[in-house]
């Protein structure tokens, strides 16, 4: 008789999850010499230990502490790029501008990017059928708690000028409920961070509006200013040209506004 299994509203654990995490860790530590000392088996043991045999709606940041500790790395604190609802462009940018880092350019972010995982209470099984959805089931699920934890630590580490890429095509360019709005903004350290510079990415070809005047951007400015951090904002009218100019800054067309 098959054992009753909780049905959650979200997709199940990504297939071959353990193998994927281990393989990503090995690849990352090979590419990044400063992380060669990391024992990927220990990293996987810590990752697994955070959610296996635990109720997937009862995960805490403390569950991830061993993983956070083992995966800690040196990222230049003044080269951090945050993003909200525009992951692909942010990643394309850091692939070109190699001295800047998104969370997914760090070991822990790289391990978990685009993956889903959860376990079941009191069994050592990984649930490949379904996992809790943040809205429909519970917020303290393994994936959400992981991203909240790593995002908080990433923001805490930032210093000097921190950049954030925002999606100008969305109704809420700055969304208080996003990871950026609910976690990262509130964990920037005013004693270390001088300025948050927002890059608002335009979607439409002919869109020449100043999206830095958007009410949600003004709301972001207000939150940041209240935290004694300066705020600045730039429109990126042509993201394609923006990336091209990052690749080839000497190009004559790159002196004009992008």
């Amino acid at each position: 008789v098959p054992r009753w299994r909780q049905q959650w509203s979200g997709p199940g654990t990504t297939k071959r999850f353990p193998e994927t995490v281990l393989a990503r860790c090995v690849k990352y530590t090979e590419i990044h010499p400063e992380m060669r000392h990391v024992d990927c088996q220990s990293v996987w043991d810590a990752f697994k230990g955070a959610f296996i045999s635990k109720h997937p709606c009862n995960i805490t940041e403390e569950d991830y502490q061993p993983l956070m500790k083992l995966g800690t790395q040196t990222v230049p604190c003044n080269k951090i790029l945050l993003w909200s609802r525009i992951k692909d462009l942010a990643h394309q940018f850091t692939q070109v501008q190699r001295d800047m880092f998104t969370l997914e350019d760090t070991l822990l972010g790289y391990l978990a990017d685009d993956l889903t995982w959860c376990g079941e209470f009191n069994t050592s099984k990984i649930n490949y059928q379904s996992c809790p959805d943040w809205r429909k089931d519970c917020s303290n699920n393994p994936v959400s708690v992981f991203w909240k934890t790593v995002s908080r630590r990433f923001a805490e580490a930032a210093c000097d000028v921190v950049h954030v890429m925002l999606n100008g095509s969305r109704s809420k360019i700055f969304d208080k409920n996003s990871t950026f709005g609910s976690v990262e903004v509130h964990n920037l350290q005013p004693e270390k961070v001088q300025t948050l510079e927002a890059w608002v990415i335009h979607g439409g070809r002919e869109d020449s509006r100043d999206l830095c005047q958007d009410p949600t951007i003004k709301e972001l400015e207000s939150i940041i200013s209240k935290r004694n951090i300066q705020f600045s904002c730039k429109n990126i009218y042509r993201p394609d040209k923006f990336l091209q100019c990052v690749k080839n800054p000497e190009d004559s067309s790159c002196t004009s506004e992008i």
Partner: antibody
């Protein structure tokens, strides 16, 4: 080989502060946590806090929060532990150690701090 | 805080004896347990990390086992230099905590 060399013994008055140093060599200082542990005379081991020198991450034992500050100087591969508002119960040997797989693989020789009026 | 309880707190044994020290955590610590040896006036030395991994340079007569809440350090054949105090330590959650120690004395 990995070595952690600590500063010398200190005698301090109650209410004052002490700063113990821990100079690391034989490995990449910025890649490993440095842990601080103390041991009162005839007693067991007590974890105080740690630092990841490459990112400045620190974690402290709540018991010492507000009294202990752990810092690191990358240029000299040296970690520091400062304990303030000293009292007689703080008389102990203070150790630094390198973190490895959530344990501590190499230890300094220890620094005796005596708090006495 | 996670409490670490070692037993026994002291034991007397002879050279060549097999010695077992246990450590119990007040909650699940997975495999994040270290074992240390300390001699009077000296800094502790790591013997075992991650419950069962022998640290570099540690003699193979030392071994560790366990996961979850119950752990064991075994010395297969006690040598004169093994008379010391042994501590376990959990690394699962802050604050890291140590057992109270087990003193191994000569019978």
């Amino acid at each position: 080989q990995v070595q952690l060399v600590q500063s010398g013994a200190e005698v301090k008055k109650p209410g004052s502060s002490v700063k113990v140093s821990c100079k690391a060599s034989g490995y990449t200082f910025t890649n490993h946590w440095i842990e601080w542990v103390r041991q009162a005379p005839g007693q067991g081991l007590e974890w105080m806090g740690d630092i990841f020198p490459g990112g400045g991450y620190t974690d402290y034992n709540e018991k010492f929060k507000g009294r202990v500050t752990i810092t690191a100087d990358e240029s000299t591969s040296t970690a520091y532990m400062e304990l303030s508002s000293l009292r007689s119960e703080d008389t102990a040997v203070y150790y630094c150690a390198r973190g490895r797989d959530l344990a501590m693989d190499y230890w300094g020789q220890g620094t005796l701090v005596t708090v006495s009026s | 805080d996670i409490q670490m309880t070692q037993s026994p707190s002291s034991l007397s044994a002879s050279v060549g004896d097999r010695v077992t020290i246990t450590c119990r955590a007040s909650q699940n610590i997975n495999v994040w347990l270290g074992w240390y040896q300390q001699k009077p006036g000296k800094a502790p030395k790591l013997l075992i990390y991650k419950a069962s991994n022998l640290h570099t340079g540690v003699p193979s007569r030392f071994s560790g086992s366990g996961s979850g809440t119950d752990f064991t350090l075994t010395i297969s054949s006690l040598q004169p230099e093994d008379f010391a105090t042994y501590y376990c330590q959990q690394g699962q959650s802050y604050p890291y905590t140590f057992g109270q120690g087990t003193k191994v004395e000569i019978k």
